[in-house]
Interface confidence: medium
């Protein structure tokens, strides 16, 4: 059942479609209680009882995680894949998603990216787009499929609030971020605006309403002078490096 789906409450997830299937067909009414989708077993997880989030692809993990089998050789033999911590600079990698934000995989090593302000996933997305492989466009997710680069060239850039598949679908100053069980173009964050800090553990609510990343020259940090009894409810804002 959906209730048994484990949720890493920090990572932005591509949630399973309602009812666990491929999503409703156009015109159908999917009125499953929305809370079921994100009230998994570890919604109120603590550092002590952290449970890894099972995944099928990197997109399902947080910005500083990637999807892989926890033990070598298990993948492809029915082994469960989970979200693992990203690899830092100069660590070995097999693909871009394995490297931490601001890095990319070159010759099997995580190297610093020239575009360190880009969100993690932008590089992979451009590669996926060129291959015409929209593997993350799940039916029922509420956004159109595009399977060729050609169709992208003639596609009007999405405005704020417009449904998208990836950030390159959106106009300048916008990124493609989850909103409900879809993705829409949202503004890249400016200085002082609330941002989401993705950690491996802790945090309180699943971000089914994903924010964009902070703009160039900004980092998502805990708001100074924001003294909170509970760490989980502290606000993070985009601040100058």
């Amino acid at each position: 059942t959906l209730n048994s789906v484990l949720i890493n409450s920090n990572a932005i997830k591509n949630l399973p479609p309602p009812l666990g299937g491929a999503g409703g067909q156009p015109g159908s009414a999917v009125s499953v209680a929305p809370g079921v989708l994100y009230e998994g077993g570890n919604k109120y997880q603590t550092l002590d009882n952290y449970q890894p989030y099972p995944c099928a692809e990197d997109e399902e993990c947080g910005s500083d995680e990637y999807c892989s089998s926890p033990s070598r050789g298990a993948a492809g033999v029915g082994g469960v894949q989970i979200c693992l911590a990203c690899r830092k600079r100069r660590k070995r990698c097999m693909r871009h998603a394995m490297c931490c934000p601001g890095n990319y995989c070159k010759n099997g090593i995580c190297m610093p990216s020239d575009h360190s302000h880009f969100p993690r996933g932008e590089i992979e997305e451009s590669i996926i787009e060129n291959l015409g492989n929209d593997h993350n466009a799940a039916a029922g997710d509420g956004y159109p499929r595009r399977t060729t680069l050609t169709s992208k060239i003639y596609h009007t850039k999405g405005q704020e609030g417009s449904v998208c598949l990836r950030s390159s679908d959106c106009a300048a100053g916008l990124c493609c971020a989850r909103h409900f069980w879809s993705k829409i173009c949202k503004p890249v964050l400016k200085e002082g605006q609330v941002c989401t800090k993705h950690k491996r553990k802790g945090s309180h609510g699943l971000e089914i309403f994903q924010r964009c990343y902070c703009g160039e020259g900004l980092a998502c940090r805990i708001q100074k002078d924001h003294h909170q009894a509970s760490n989980s409810s502290r606000l993070h804002t985009c601040q100058r490096h």
């Epitope: 479609p17 309602p18 999503g23 409703g24 067909q25 156009p26 015109g27 159908s28 009414a29 999917v30 009125s31 209680a33 929305p34 809370g35 994100y38 009230e39 919604k43 039916a139 029922g140 997710d141 509420g142 956004y143 159109p144 009007t156 999405g158 405005q159 704020e160 609030g161 417009s162 449904v163 909103h179 409900f180 069980w181 879809s182 829409i184 949202k186 503004p187 002082g192 605006q193 609330v194 989401t196 309180h204 609510g205 971000e207 089914i208 309403f209 924010r211 409810s233 606000l235």
Partner: antibody, heavy 116, light 112 residues
Framework: QVQLVESGGGLVQPGGSLRLSCAAS????????MSWVRQAPGKGLEWVSV????????YYADSVKGRFTISRDNSKNTLYLQMNSLRAEDTAVYYC?????????WGQGTLVTVSS | DIALTQPASVSGSPGQSITISCTGT?????????VSWYQQHPGKAPKLMIY???NRPSGVSNRFSGSKSGNTASLTISGLQAEDEADYYC???????????FGGGTKLTVLG
């Protein structure tokens, strides 16, 4: 500019049905989630339902689940709300709202009165 | 059911600053940093003033600002003007069956 115009409201008896429409213009209707929000006379706002851009997902408030159906026709740039088994407590101004970054654009509303 | 609690009324004089609070629970406002504020003048449709706690849509005056601490969000209006007199509603997302929750609304009166 973005424009949303509701229609179809009126007086209906308890147990009756009504279909509201919302004509959208000034934006790419087929690219946006849309919602219905209502406001009883002298009361606050209450979210009713939301539909995804391609109609594949619809969600409802508990108070209307099983009685109301949200739908859309992207070729006509129109959002609908079919309301069945109406009750006195459904009396309200019904607004259609574009659900972009939250409810970023609203129509002027249409009044639905359920009374015998 | 009103999920978020707001004061029924708030008042202030022109030029002053006022703050409207909105209190929820860890299942809604406290659990998500997604709070929006709407302004509604009598007989008119609501207008989005703040989203994502403290973001202003284009065209909204910078006199309007939002913040959040724990389970409580706040809307602050500085340099109060006569045209600010209206009803203000907070809105958040929630777990459970109701996806979108509103506050009961606060009537802002600008004195004088």
């Amino acid at each position: 500019q973005v424009q949303l115009v509701e229609s179809g409201g009126g007086l209906v008896q308890p147990g009756g049905s009504l279909r509201l429409s919302c004509a959208a213009s000034g934006f790419t209707f087929s690219s946006y989630w849309m919602s219905w929000v209502r406001q009883a006379p002298g009361k606050g706002l209450e979210w009713v339902s939301v539909i995804s851009s391609d109609s594949s997902s619809t969600y409802y408030a508990d108070s209307v689940k099983g009685r109301f159906t949200i739908s859309r026709d992207n070729s006509k740039n129109t959002l609908y709300l079919q309301m069945n088994s109406l009750r006195a407590e459904d009396t309200a101004v019904y607004y259609c709202a574009r659900h972009g970054i939250d409810f970023d654009h609203w129509g002027q509303g249409t009044l639905v009165t359920v009374s015998s | 059911d009103i999920a978020l609690t707001q004061p029924a009324s708030v008042s202030g004089s022109p030029g002053q600053s006022i703050t409207i609070s909105c209190t929820g629970t860890s299942s809604d406002l406290g659990g998500y940093n997604y709070v929006s504020w709407y302004q509604q003048h009598p007989g008119k449709a609501p207008k989005l003033m703040i989203y994502d706690v403290n973001n202003r849509p284009s065209g909204v005056s910078n006199r309007f600002s939002g913040s959040k601490s724990g389970n409580t969000a706040s809307l602050t209006i500085s340099g109060l003007q006569a045209e600010d007199e209206a009803d203000y509603y907070c809105q958040s997302y929630a777990s459970g069956n109701t996806k979108v929750v509103f506050g009961g609304g606060t009537k802002l009166t600008v004195l004088g």
